[in-house]
Interface confidence: medium
Amino acid sequence: FKVATPYSLYVCPEGQNVTLTCRLLGPVDKGHDVTFYKTWYRSSRGEVQTCSERRPIRNLTFQDLHLHHGGHQAANTSHDLAQRHGLESASDHHGNFSITMRNLTLLDSGLYCCLVVEIRHHHSEHRVHGAMELQVQTGKDAPSNCVVYPSSSQESENITAA
């Protein structure tokens, strides 16, 4: 399986909400001994390997934010903890999964990584990630809504609040 990132860059005004999105592609093993985790974390730029370093998102670790199930199933974080931090992660039946961040501040700017981990027998770990950048802007140059830049081309799209 692979992970696709529809958008590589999100440019948002301060105070706005944004939903960062990834998509799980390809066949997934539905064996009884296989579990899938989908999660999010922050990383830093300028590494040899993108997403190799991990940091919490608004003080929440990847384990606080994960969705855990047996494949292309729908799920949501119902964690009060995440929602108290203005975060919610979700996934649908089509392999899409996302994290919504509410009331963005300049401190939310940075590199975000989505991750899919396949675990067999509760032990061995196979993982695939995608990366995207969030830029939160303030002042007169900030867009009125989030602007997203597709990964495959330079065309941008305006999106309204999540």
């Epitope: 985790y37 991990r54 606080d64 032990h123 061995s124 196979h126 993982r127």
Partner: antibody, heavy 121, light 112 residues
């Protein structure tokens, strides 16, 4: 840079307990597992247990699950391993080591300098 | 638990020569989903902590000299040091991380 710094050597009597610390720096402490591995004199490496500091959830080698207790202090980025009911065969160097896994198991990319624990009457 | 067996226990080699260390696992550490071998090698010098050399059976850790190479798949693995330098005389451990964690007993590489 990423570093794990352990507490100093300990000498304990049989039946006592020892608590070894491991202070992390240079990375997000809450997001990486900390493992404890020991090495008896002239012997190989033996995995004891691991803990995920973000949640405090710990996982133990069956051999040590009744005697080892792992804890963390997130405010000081420090992990602890306490080993109780010490016996002479627990004399060893105890290492903390970071692993890079998310939910499964992974290799150990950073090691502490080791803490020598001697159990002697 | 997966058992790891290293041989020989001691290897006597002259500086500049090649050293070949063996590690065998009691069951395969190859993961079918990604065709990766969950095996690492560490170097330990006297009085020091282990240092990661190789992971995924053949990927060198950053900063490790290219005279170190790992090979093998499934249950049989080899660490090769192509031309031994004085700083390479140490104990080497293999480590499987497919199912919990186990280490081999180590191979001591000493000066001949």
């Amino acid at each position: 840079q990423v570093q794990l710094v352990q507490s100093g050597a300990e000498v304990k009597k049989p039946g006592a307990s020892v608590k070894v610390s491991c202070k992390a720096s240079g990375y997000s402490f809450t997001d990486y597992y900390i493992n404890w591995v020991r090495q008896a004199p002239g012997q190989g490496l033996e995995w004891i247990a691991r803990i995920f500091p973000g949640s405090g959830n710990a996982y133990y080698n069956e051999k040590f699950k009744d005697r080892a207790t792992l804890t963390v202090d997130k405010s000081t980025s420090t992990a602890y391993m306490e080993l109780s009911s010490l016996r002479s065969e627990d004399t060893a160097v105890y290492y903390c080591a970071r692993d890079d896994s998310f939910y499964g198991y992974w290799y150990f990319d950073v090691w502490g300098q080791g803490t020598t624990v001697t159990v002697s009457s | 638990n997966i058992m790891m067996t290293q041989s020989p226990a001691t290897l006597s080699v002259s500086p500049g020569e090649r050293a070949t260390l063996s590690c065998k696992s009691s069951q395969s550490v190859l993961y079918s989903s990604n065709q990766k071998n969950y095996l690492a090698w560490y170097q330990q010098k006297p009085g020091q902590s282990p240092r990661l050399l190789i992971y995924w059976a053949s990927t060198r850790e950053s900063g490790v000299p290219d005279r170190f190479s790992g090979s093998g798949s499934g249950t049989e693995f080899t660490l090769t040091i192509s031309s031994l330098q004085s700083e390479d005389f140490a104990v080497y451990y293999c480590h499987q991380y497919l199912s919990s964690y186990t280490f081999g007993g180590g191979t001591k590489v000493e000066i001949k």
